[in-house]
């Protein structure tokens, strides 16, 4: 009766993501074979979270409804591991949005999750950000510096990455 | 007022290269981005790519990718557009345009037409 | 890429008719289009954007809905200036393709 009753929340809980998720890839957390974490097929995984690489090209607004759309919001990149495990999935001659805008061009930059902005956790190529008008982060490739981030005019339309919470079954 | 003037017509051999220009006034030319979009006569729209006048980002249509090349001069507020390896079917006029703070084309430069015939 | 069917590509109408023209995306495109008039000889005029929205100086007559794939672009009472071509464009992702036009001409 337990097992019915699991399995049947389980399903439900399925359904919910269906629209925008056919199909899952679950792993089994740890020895109790209860828990369950899942990302949509095939988005990768690292820690609690999902990741996309969109190759669409679109404005940093459009990317963001993009991601929203999905049940996700451009990734918040919390630590140095998360951004190593992040460009693993890139490709050097593009471009990526990330969840970090200036909307006032007064560089108080925000994360879209209302994460806190930690200058300590930022991970800027030199010399960036450097222009009140370029008002959105991506991450891209130096050969110099190799992966870090840059400031870029919100409307010039990049690849992105979206990221969401693990869905637990 | 806002202002996007374009450069005169042009008339080029196949395989030739041309560069149409697009001079901006009226407003903070590194602030906006510019389009570029043409029109073969009588026939209808096509987006060709977008440059960021600050800092020379581009991303252009994969259709003419390898032949467009668009760049811009900031100390003449100045945008262009060069596309090689021209070809008859490139016959068309040549719009830029800015793409104002909503992410529409709101204010457009009175094209160029490009001519290409042996 | 994102293609947009426009209907009907051409149309004859009079002085004071009520003129509608679609547009199809052949994706979501999450209400981000915009509407233009052109004229012989000139450059494309924003009429709306955001599927709905009228640019500044735009007469009332003008009006959008839609969404999803489907738009529509409505003029309530046609006058004799709106004889023109009408263009949709979307701006989901690049490229940002624009349907085939709708030719209005006076019947």
């Known amino acids: 009766n337990f097992m019915y009753s699991k399995t049947v929340k389980r399903l439900s809980k399925l359904r919910e993501y269906q629209q925008y998720h056919p199909s899952l890839t679950c792993v089994m957390e740890g020895k109790d074979i209860e828990d369950w974490s899942c990302c949509p097929t095939p988005w990768t995984s690292f820690q609690s979270s999902c990741y996309f690489i969109s190759t669409g090209m679109q404005s940093w607004t459009k990317s963001q409804k993009n991601c929203s759309v999905m049940g996700a919001d451009l990734v918040v990149i919390n630590t140095r591991e998360e951004q190593d495990f992040i460009i693993q999935n890139l490709k050097r001659n593009s471009s990526y949005f990330l969840g970090l805008s200036d909307p006032g061009g007064r560089r108080h930059w925000q994360w879209v999750d209302q994460t806190p902005y930690n200058e300590n956790v930022t991970f800027w190529h030199s010399g960036e950000p450097n222009n009140l008008d370029e008002r959105c982060a991506i991450i891209n490739f130096r050969s110099s510096e190799e992966w870090g981030w840059n400031d870029i005019h919100c409307h010039v339309p990049q690849k992105s990455i979206c990221k969401m919470k693990k869905i637990y079954i | 007022q806002v202002q996007l003037v374009q450069s005169g017509a042009e008339v080029k051999k196949p395989g030739a290269s041309v560069k149409v220009s697009c001079k901006a006034s009226g407003y903070t030319f590194t602030s906006y981005i510019i389009h570029w979009v043409r029109q073969a006569p009588g026939q209808g729209l096509e987006w060709m790519g977008t440059i960021y006048p600050g800092g020379g980002d581009t991303s252009y249509n994969q259709k003419f990718k390898g032949r467009v090349t668009m760049t811009r001069d900031t100390s003449t507020s100045t945008v262009y557009m060069e596309l090689s390896s021209l070809r008859s079917e490139d016959t068309a006029v040549y719009y830029c345009a800015r793409m104002g703070d909503n992410e529409y084309f709101d204010y457009w430069g009175q094209g160029t037409l490009v001519t290409v015939s042996s | 890429d994102i293609q947009m069917t426009q209907s009907p590509s051409s149309l004859s109408a009079s002085v004071g008719d009520r003129v509608t023209i679609t547009c199809r995306a052949s994706?979501?495109?999450?209400?981000?289009l915009a509407w233009y008039q052109q004229k012989p000889g000139k450059a494309p005029k924003l009429l709306l954007y955001?599927?709905?929205t009228l640019a500044d100086g735009v007469p009332s007559r003008f009006s959008g809905s839609g969404s999803g794939t489907d738009y529509t672009l409505t003029i309530s009472s046609l006058q004799p200036e709106d004889f023109a071509t009408y263009y949709c464009?979307?701006?989901?992702?690049?490229?940002?393709?624009f349907g085939g036009g709708t030719k209005v001409e006076i019947k």
């Open positions: 955001d599927a709905e």
């Open positions: 994706g979501n495109i999450h209400n981000y």
């Open positions: 464009q979307h701006f989901w992702s690049t490229p940002y393709t």
